[in-house]
Interface confidence: medium
């Protein structure tokens, strides 16, 4: 009994210092339905120029799931559709363009953008983005306050690529590029983003964990992989 | 670094119209959010409207609607702003200003300013 | 449009005190607020972002906290060149909109 009271403590211990170890920032968007999401991811130039580029989401618990991806290789200024959601891959600026349109309740949740490099696992851009979508008048008439640019054309010339099948929830430890993000609805007062509203997500990774490089109570991970240990020795 | 720099000076009758630049240099113009804010003599701060010249996306206060247009040259890294119908109250210092920090909301902050055009409408 | 009001409108300081100006936004903006300072016959400058985070190469006698509708500019202590008007701005909605401004004085 006091051994498991002693594992499980151990555990708490160990994941409390993962999450530690492991913050990724997010940052929140709060919208309504009908509008437009518009994100500008960034990447490093000469790396990644033309690479397949992905935008996923991440539900609880879940492994991330891709939605859309550009063509590979991904090719300059050219829409890729899928569904709602448009991508637009700027070599030249090093950015990729992603929109979600006439956004849905549903469409909450949390996001990202990722770069495919296989046999790798993929590239994540960092931040995350958390998207809250909710019920209410997107574009009153007679408003007040409106966006120079209400509606969203979809390209004419969208393509639709295919994605690598495989996701990875895995972190990329590199200096994060950051992201960023404008809204264009007819709003009468345009909710742009709770942009400041920045989270520390905790990312449970089992890979990096089990590598070990990086807890800094590196006596935690001993005992607790001794006793792990000894729990399995008849 | 980017640096901002506006056209000058600008007297205009009532009734005509001004267009001002702001030529960016030493950074990235495309991707950054080019915000026009203007000030009367004696006043405050009033932002007039902003473009993303990479995507063309531009918001603008409905104050000014049917009067401003905000347009971005990407090949010169120049952004301009007419303002239409002018009027005596229209007299004021116009700044362009861009936010290039960037964190996923163009319009952040505006962290680097021109050094403003001043337009004077008289009759 | 969201409403922020800067009080005082002008206030009198001597090197040295600590200085407080206050924005409340009429409508919750969460952190979503930038400062500015301007001197007579230049472009302002910005100062905070994220309601509290300082921007770079700004002294650190500067500081911003707040959030939902009331904010705060803090100047620990005034120095000489410290002399001029302050704004506020959100951006958390279309259109952007600034304060009135404080214009701080010598005492």
């Known amino acids: 009994m006091r051994k498991t009271r002693l594992w499980g403590l151990l555990w708490m211990l160990f994941v409390s210092e993962l999450r530690a170890a492991t913050k990724l920032t997010e940052e929140k968007y709060e919208l309504k339905e009908g509008q437009t999401l518009d994100v500008k991811c960034d990447y490093t130039l000469e790396k990644f120029a033309s690479s397949q580029k992905a935008w996923q989401i991440i539900r609880d618990g879940e492994m991330p799931k891709t939605l859309a991806c550009t063509e590979r290789p991904s090719k300059n200024s050219h829409p890729v559709q899928v569904g709602r959601i448009i991508l637009e891959d700027y070599h030249d600026h090093g950015l990729l363009r992603v929109r979600m349109v006439n956004l849905q309740v549903e469409d909450s949740g949390l996001y990202q953008c990722v770069i495919y490099q296989p046999p790798k696992e993929p590239h994540m851009l960092f931040d995350r983005i958390r998207l809250v979508v909710t019920k209410g008048f997107s574009g009153t008439p007679g408003s007040n306050e409106n966006s120079t640019q209400n509606v969203y054309k979809i390209p004419p010339t969208t393509t639709k690529a295919l994605c690598p099948l495989y996701t990875s929830p895995r972190t990329v430890t590199q200096a994060p590029p950051k992201s960023t993000a404008d809204v264009s609805t007819p709003d009468s007062e345009i909710n742009l983003t709770n942009v400041t509203d920045i989270i520390r997500v905790p990312v449970f990774n089992i890979v990096i964990l089990l590598a070990g490089g990086f807890l800094s109570k590196s006596l935690v991970f001993s005992v607790l992989f001794a006793v792990t240990l000894r729990s399995f020795v008849p | 670094q980017v640096q901002l720099v506006q056209s000058g000076a600008e007297v205009k009758r009532p009734g005509s119209s001004v267009k001002v630049s702001c030529k960016a240099s030493?950074?990235?113009?495309?991707?950054?959010?080019i915000s026009w804010v203007r000030q009367a003599p004696g006043q405050g701060l009033e932002w007039m409207g902003g473009?993303?010249?990479?995507?063309?996306?531009?918001n603008g206060a409905q104050k000014f609607q049917g009067r401003v247009t905000i347009t971005a040259d990407e090949s010169t890294s120049t952004a301009y702003m007419e303002l239409s119908s002018l009027r005596s109250e229209d007299t004021a210092v116009y700044y362009c200003?861009?936010?290039?920090?960037?964190?996923?909301?163009?319009?952040?902050?505006?962290?680097?300013w021109g050094q403003g055009t001043t337009v004077t409408v008289s009759s | 449009a969201i409403q922020l009001t800067q009080s005082p409108s002008s206030l009198s300081a001597s090197v040295g005190d600590r200085v407080t100006i206050t924005c409340r936004a009429s409508?919750?903006?969460?952190?979503?607020l930038a400062w500015y300072q301007q001197k007579p016959g230049k472009a302002p400058k910005l100062l905070i972002y994220?309601?509290?985070s300082l921007q770079s190469g700004v002294p650190s006698r500067f500081s911003g906290s707040g959030s939902g509708t009331d904010f705060t500019l803090t100047i620990s202590s005034l120095q000489p060149e410290d002399f001029a008007t302050y704004y506020c701005?959100?951006?958390?909605?279309?259109?952007?909109?600034f304060g009135g401004g404080t214009k701080v004085e010598i005492k």
């Open positions: 200003a861009a936010m290039v920090r960037g964190n996923y909301f163009y319009f952040y902050g505006m962290d680097v």
């Open positions: 030493g950074g990235t113009f495309s991707s950054s959010a």
């Open positions: 473009i993303i010249p990479i995507f063309g996306t531009t």
């Open positions: 409508q919750g903006i969460s952190s979503a």
């Open positions: 994220a309601a509290s």
């Open positions: 701005q959100q951006y958390n909605s279309y259109p952007l909109t």
